[in-house]
């Protein structure tokens, strides 16, 4: 029968002569040269030699255990006079023995994670994992350890796992974003003589709300002309945010003031602007200076960050109203008047006022608009409003006169008003009858 | 051309009250803002408050607010500040001060009075 | 409230000097901001306004520049009838003035 154990080689064997690898030999062999050796199978007569005379065998190359781990051959004794063999052929096994000869690899050259800024210590931001080409069944040859080079105090690394967490309190996207972290996995358990590999892992904070809005002044002042219809913009606010996205969104509100019910505050999505608008009409005249509030603040808001202070902020919008000049207002919408058709010249009908509605008071004069009362029939005193005949007047040639007064202010000619002026003329008995028969 | 003349210096007792005035010429009294300002001895310049001698409308500096009141009279074209419950703090030169502009309550000041000085000691 | 801080707070200065004094706001008050000039005993006199603009009548070696927040007022050669106070305003909110330059006779 034959008589071997398990052959074992070590790989990468670097000496100038063959490395031996064992002993075929049969107990039918005498030791007289009756008996050829052959070898067949996995890298026979190439890889591996047998001495035919001897049974022993030797490997012509540096074999690499990571390459193939276990080589199977088949073994047969032949009586060299009758080449009958004399033992049945057999398998067996050349075991490629481990040494350390690969560093970890990392299953990716550089990883890329996020975390939330702020995250208690100990959040878990992302594994990485080295895999070393070693026989992990025999040493630690692929027992690998991981440590951080490059991230502390940021972060730490489980050195048995390759999870990587937060290791310092409050970490501030705001004050730093992106971290290049090197992790290296180093195998004989981290021990000395181990071979090690790194990777780079590209940390960047994702942002949380731990930052309120912030306006810039306290103070903002615009002007618009009482004449701004309701809806008109008459000023921009910004507040910023350090933080971004959602986070950084702002919405705006008037809390307090005089021009509470007078302006809104509308937030351009697009800008995050706060856009002060007109909501009633402004007058003036009755006030001309408007002092609001106005609060910016972020519709999400996380609890955990609230003991940072309130998210939100607050400014004073000053708001100046601009005098527009009006045409002088008229007491009526329409004068009537009566007159009876026997008034002589110069007899007063009536009078009209016109005011200037402006603060300043500007003074009025008073004219007829010649175009309706083409005859000069009428005339007003300029500076009373009181109108009086300028000719005389038969109510059977007209019964109602039409006429149109204007009113301009003596020190802005170029505001005037104008009002109708309905006058009746009253009959007196001035006609004797005609065309009556008088029958006897 | 425009001048603004203030009343003579006064001397007040503490809690008492005060009345400087301030006589406009050489422009059209109701169309701008009338400002007073104080100054405390080798002190800055303080804004107190101003009116719209068109319809008597008012804006006063809080730190004054309930003290001070500011009137005009159209007929003479004249402004007036009165200052009342005064403490010695209050012992200053007040100026009136046309606002430069007749259509808003802002801008600068173009125009001064010589300024009235109010003494207020026991 | 919006603060004016005005420096230095005096110098001396002899005549056919470049004098500048600097105003600085507590906020953006854009070029709302007035510069004057006070004499012991009188009211102050407006010199220029919108930063920059010189007021008329006030000689041309005044000068003012800045906007927002940094202001100017430069006096090219300094002549005998400067030597006074000078204090400068902001109106873009409300009315605020520097604590003033004593600009002295070296």
């Known amino acids: 029968s034959w008589m071997w154990n398990q052959f074992f080689l070590l790989e990468e064997y670097t000496g100038s002569d063959y490395q031996y690898v064992g002993k075929l030999h049969s107990d039918q062999d005498r030791g007289d040269g009756s008996l050829k050796y052959i070898l067949s199978g996995d890298g026979a007569g190439d890889l591996f030699i047998i001495n035919e005379n001897t049974g022993d065998i030797q490997a012509t190359k540096r074999l690499d255990r990571e390459e193939k781990p276990v080589y199977i051959l088949r073994a047969q004794a032949i009586n060299r006079r009758t080449g009958r063999p004399v033992e049945p052929e057999s398998e067996f096994i050349i075991k490629i023995h481990d040494i350390n000869d690969n560093e970890p690899i990392f299953t990716k050259e550089v990883y890329t994670a996020t975390v939330p800024e702020m995250s208690d210590v100990g959040t878990f931001v992302v594994q990485v994992t080295a895999t070393d080409a070693d026989d992990p069944t025999y040493g630690n040859s692929a027992k690998v350890v991981y440590s951080i080079l490059q991230g502390q105090p940021y972060f730490s690394v489980e050195s048995e796992t390759g999870i990587i967490k937060t290791a310092l309190l409050n970490m501030d996207r705001e004050n730093r974003e992106q971290y290049q972290v090197v992790i290296q996995a180093k195998d004989m358990g981290g021990q000395m003589g181990g071979l090690s590999g790194t990777t780079t892992v590209n940390i960047t904070l994702t942002d949380v709300n731990d930052n309120p809005p912030r306006f810039p002044q306290s103070t903002y002042q615009f002007k618009t002309p009482e004449s701004s219809p309701p809806g008109t913009p008459i000023g921009r606010i910004k507040a910023s945010d350090a933080d971004v996205g959602e986070n950084a969104e702002i919405e705006y509100s008037i809390t307090d003031g005089e021009g509470l019910d007078m302006f809104d505050v509308i937030t351009d999505q697009e800008t995050q602007e706060g856009i002060i608008t007109v909501k009633k009409l402004l007058d003036f005249e009755k006030k001309k200076v408007y002092t609001l509030k106005v609060e910016a603040s972020n519709p999400y808001v996380e609890p955990r960050f609230l003991y940072l202070g309130p998210f939100k902020d607050s400014a004073t919008v000053r708001i100046v109203v601009e005098d527009v000049d009006e045409p002088p207002v008229f007491s009526k919408l329409a004068y009537i008047l009566q007159i009876r058709e026997d008034a002589q010249i110069n007899t007063t009908i009536g009078s009209v006022t016109a005011q200037d509605p402006d603060a300043a008071r500007n003074p009025v004069k008073y004219s007829v608009d010649r175009h309706t009362d083409m005859d000069r029939i009428f005339n007003i005193d300029s500076g009373n409003g009181s109108i009086f005949t300028s000719k005389l007047l038969d109510r059977e040639t007209l019964l109602w006169h039409n006429i149109t007064v204007i009113a301009t202010e003596i020190n802005n000619p170029k505001q005037s008003s104008r009002v109708p002026l309905y006058i009746k003329v009253l009959d007196v008995n001035d006609n004797a009858p005609t065309g009556l028969s008088t029958g006897a | 051309e425009v001048q603004l003349v203030q009343s003579g210096a006064e001397v007040k007792k503490p809690g008492a009250s005060v009345k400087v005035s301030c006589k406009a010429s050489g422009y059209t009294f109701t169309r701008n803002f009338m400002h007073w300002v104080r100054q405390a001895p080798g002190q800055g310049l303080e804004w107190m408050g101003w009116?719209?001698?068109?319809?008597?409308?008012?804006e006063y500096n809080q730190k004054f607010q309930g003290r001070v009141t500011i009137t005009a009279d159209r007929s003479t074209s004249t402004a007036y500040m009165e200052l009342s419950s005064l403490r010695s703090e209050d012992t200053a030169v007040y100026f009136c001060?046309?606002?430069?502009?007749?259509?808003?309550?802002?801008?600068?000041?173009?125009?001064w009075g010589q300024g009235t000085l109010v003494t207020v000691s026991s | 409230d919006i603060q004016m801080t005005q420096s230095p707070s005096s110098l001396s200065a002899s005549v056919g000097d470049r004098v500048t004094i600097t105003c600085k706001a507590s906020q953006n008050i854009y070029k709302n901001l007035a510069w004057y000039q006070q004499k012991l005993g009188e009211g102050p006199k407006l010199l220029i306004y919108d930063a920059n603009t010189l007021q008329t009548g006030v000689p041309s070696r005044f000068s003012g520049s800045g906007s927002g927040t940094d202001f100017t007022l430069t006096i090219s050669s300094l002549q005998p009838e400067d030597f006074a106070t000078y204090y400068c305003q902001q109106y873009y909110s409300g009315w605020a003035f520097g604590q003033g330059t004593k600009v002295e006779i070296k």
């Open positions: 009116i719209y001698p068109g319809d008597g409308e008012t």
């Open positions: 001060a046309r606002g430069v502009y007749g259509g808003f309550a802002g801008g600068y000041f173009d125009f």
